[in-house]
């Protein structure tokens, strides 16, 4: 079975009313932008055949992939919003560094390979989906992490 | 098959207590987030209270915070709520709601068939 | 007071279509992707029939179908029949983190 290590996060990460704001500000901004609407990026799919305790390493997963190849190359748009979460979910994503998972990790990385080809596969707009979904990605590593 | 049953309902006097309990079964209880949600005779839906997994986020309504506590035994696959200082606007029927899925506990797939809380004088 | 507004009622004939609207501050549908939509018959436990804004669990008839524009999530009963006559309500997660729901909407079925 599989053993996590260190895969937690503070409450206090998420008891920030402006940060939280901000978050959800500018998934809004980019949800407006979005207009592929049947296409969920972190939903039941991604969640399907892993269990609770191995969630926020999925989530990790998830995070360092839209911090690296979605928020990085947006960066310059959504502006105040974008320059004030960056650091925050980077600075999650540093708490998260030694959250590891020994054992069968094989739905995990198939789940998150499957988020990953989605978001490329759309090419500009799987990124403004991707960003449009940085609420669903925060409350989803606060109910798997904390 | 996914089974909530609540119990711990009655009648109680205002400033009062009450501890509900569910008993979940049919399917793996810590991989779910949890609530209570509650209706009033005649009226609408009100969210209560919500857990997560592992209980290391527990979140209230304004209406209750700082009177009732969420709390789960995922050793005895169970989802209480302490209720304490209970008003006459308490009087509901409270039901134990589980996630749809593992990842959302907030859409509520599952539902209890609910136990009735009547607070009076 | 619910935070979410959803209309007291609304009515349609057999093979009609109908439209729930649920509108919300912009703290509640508009900012976000956790839009529920349940139904209850009365004296009955209620029933999810939208999640995710507009997926349906399995074995919810496909002439339910939900959407949302802004900051309001729309409910739609396509071919309305007699046993849609029930009590609908919406639901939004906030970043509060508490679950809001709409007052609820009436359905009646006319004739």
């Known amino acids: 079975l599989p053993v996590n290590t260190r895969c937690k996060l503070e409450v206090s990460n998420f008891q920030q009313p402006y940060i939280v704001n901000r978050t959800f500000m500018l998934a809004k901004e980019a949800s407006l932008a979005d207009n592929n609407t049947d296409v969920r990026l972190i939903g039941e799919k991604l969640f399907r055949g892993v269990s609770a305790k191995d969630q926020c390493y999925l989530m990790k997963q998830v995070l360092n992939f839209t911090l690296e190849d979605v928020l990085l190359p947006q960066s310059d748009r959504f502006q105040p919003y974008m320059q004030e979460v960056v650091p925050f979910l980077t600075k999650l994503s540093n708490q998260l560094s030694s959250c590891h998972i020994s054992g069968d990790d094989q739905n995990i990385q198939k789940n998150v390979r499957r988020l990953k080809e989605t978001v490329k596969k759309l090419g500009e707009s799987g990124e403004i989906k991707a960003i449009g979904e940085l609420d669903l990605l925060f409350m989803s590593l606060r109910n798997a992490c904390v | 098959e996914v089974q909530l049953v609540e119990s711990g309902g009655g009648v109680v006097r205002p400033g009062g207590s009450l501890r509900l309990s569910c008993a979940a079964s049919?399917?793996?209880?810590?991989?779910?987030?949890m609530n209570w949600v509650r209706q009033a005779p005649g009226k609408g839906l009100e969210w209560v209270s919500g857990?997560?997994?592992?209980?290391?986020?527990?979140d209230y309504a304004a209406s209750v915070k700082g009177r009732f506590t969420i709390s789960r035994d995922n050793a005895k696959n169970s989802l209480y709520l302490q209720m304490n200082s209970l008003r006459a606007e308490d009087t509901a029927l409270y039901y134990c709601?589980?996630?749809?899925?593992?990842?959302?506990?907030?859409?509520?797939?599952?539902w209890g068939r609910g136990t009735l809380v009547t607070v009076s004088s | 007071q619910a935070v979410l507004t959803q209309p007291s009622s609304v009515s349609g004939s057999p093979g009609q279509s109908v439209t729930i609207s649920c509108t919300g501050a912009?703290?509640?549908?508009?900012?976000?992707?956790?839009v529920s939509w349940y139904q209850q018959h009365p004296g009955k436990t209620p029933k999810l029939i939208i999640y995710?804004?507009?997926k349906r669990p399995s074995g919810v008839s496909n002439r339910f179908s939900g959407s949302k524009s802004g900051n309001t999530a729309s409910l739609t009963i396509s071919r309305l029949q007699a046993e849609d006559e029930s009590d609908y309500y919406c639901?939004?997660?906030?970043?509060?983190?508490?679950?809001?729901f709409g007052g609820g909407t009436k359905v009646t079925v006319l004739g």
């Open positions: 709601a589980r996630g749809w899925y593992s990842g959302s506990p907030w859409s509520l797939g599952h």
């Open positions: 049919g399917f793996t209880f810590d991989d779910y987030g």
């Open positions: 857990v997560n997994w592992n209980g290391g986020t527990r």
């Open positions: 912009s703290g509640d549908v508009g900012a976000y992707n956790f």
């Open positions: 995710d804004v507009n």
């Open positions: 639901s939004s997660y906030t970043s509060r983190y508490t679950t809001e």
